[in-house]
Structures are given as C-alpha cells and as structure tokens.
Amino acid sequence: MMTGTIETTGNISAEKGGSIILQCHLSSTTAQVTQVNWEQQDQLLAICNADLGWHISPSFKDRVAPGPGLGLTLQSLTVNDTGEYFCIYHTYPDGTYTGRIFLEVLESSVAEHGARFQIP
C-alpha cells in the first residue's frame, strides 16, 4: 500500500559540455521529508538533509550544484555522465521513496544534427 508518489523528469537528454537539472517531486503524502539523497547508479552524488543542509560528494564538487529546491544541477556534462540517476527521499513516518531518471549526454554535433534533420 503506497501512500506517496515520486514524479521525476523521466528520460532526458542534454548536450556534452552543457548543464542539466535533475528534479524529483514527492506528492500525495503528508509525510515529512527528512533527507534526500541523489545517486548516479552506484555512486552517491549529494545529500540534502532537512536540518544540516546540502553535502556534495567531494568527487563531484566541481560539477554538481545543489538545487533548485531539492533538485540537483549537473554541469560540464560528459558522455560518461550518461546513465541512471536516483532521487531517494527519506520521510517520516512513511519510509523511503525512490525516483529514477535516465540521462543521455549527446555529442554536440549529434544534438545539432538531431535538431536540423528529420529522418523520413
């Protein structure tokens, strides 16, 4: 019996060298959010704690910015940033809600061609 729902930006694509905002939103519950963790596959990117604020993992400090809100901004994107990202909401009293976002980082030329040409 689920009480809340996580809404995410879903599958998104961005250009190499650019930036992207990862956003999740927890709705349909009155539970209090105590902490949100952001993970890239098997790596912890950032933590937003209701009392302690934001902590960015040292290995991502140069390319990850907190916010807006409980979201996360990834900067200077590389093709290696392609993959799954997870927002993990810890709430009281419900428990933990997890949302998934798939990010594809495209080479600049691919992104440009995709915008200019249509395949019949």
């Epitope: 689920m2 963790n37 912890l44 810890h90 809600y97």
Partner: nanobody
Framework: EVQLVESGGGLVQPGGSLRLSCAAS????????RGWFRQAPGKGLEGVST???????????TYADSVRGRFTISRDNSKNTLYLQMNSLRAEDTAVYYC?????????????????WGQGTLVTVSS
C-alpha cells in the same frame, strides 16, 4: 528464487533483549528494501521496521512508533543477512516475527507491499 530464513526467536523476560537474524539467498539487487513484520496472537500483521540500502551508500531505516527507540534494524552485506536488535522488550512485543523483502524500491516502508517472506520466528516476552 529468493529465500529468507529467520532465526533468533525465543522466550525472554520483560526488559530483556533478543537479536533476530534473517539470512537471504537469491536477493542480490543493488537496491534493496527489506523489513521485519510481526503478528501477535489474534491480531493482524504489523510492520515493525524496514531498511532501504543501495550500492551507492544510501541507508535509510524506518520504524513503527511502537518500537522506535527500542528496536534497531541493521544488515551485514558480506553475509546478506538482516538483523533486528530488540531491547527493552515488553509483553506486547510477543508475536511471530517475519522477515520480508521487496522487489521494487519505489517505496520502502512498514506500509509497503512485500513480495517475499520468511517462515517466521516466535518471540515470547513473559516472566
């Protein structure tokens, strides 16, 4: 196939302690939602505590109000075992305790629907 085997139940006096163990096989996902539930004589199933873990390092535990501060859920990754440390036990904690695991981690909490269950272990708190 996922299999869960509990152990550690028994008879304990009020105020005493017990540690339950749940050995899992076949449950090898990078994100895990596991928990402990109990059923007291003549009553329905109650969620006691759940634990969300990921290979990215996230570790979130949740407790029912009735056990918060007295029970602690933990795990040993190397043994793929889940534990429930129960302190300051009361007569009302008497129940069959079940270990459970969930396939999806979209929601992990005492009110979630779990997919796999152990056979249960009896905890009796009595003087």
């Amino acid at each position: 196939e996922v299999q869960l085997v509990e152990s550690g139940g028994g008879l304990v006096q009020p105020g005493g302690s017990l540690r339950l163990s749940c050995a899992a096989s076949g449950y090898t996902y990078s994100r895990k939602c596991r928990g402990w539930f109990r059923q007291a004589p003549g009553k329905g199933l109650e969620g006691v505590s759940t634990l969300y873990t990921s290979s990215g390092g996230t570790y979130f535990d949740t407790y029912a109000d009735s056990v918060r501060g007295r029970f602690t859920i933990s795990r040993d990754n190397s043994k793929n075992t889940l534990y429930l440390q129960m302190n300051s036990l009361r007569a009302e904690d008497t129940a069959v305790y079940y270990c459970a695991a969930r396939l999806s981690t979209d929601f992990c909490g005492p009110r979630a629907d779990f997919d796999y269950w152990g056979q249960g272990t009896l905890v009796t708190v009595s003087s």
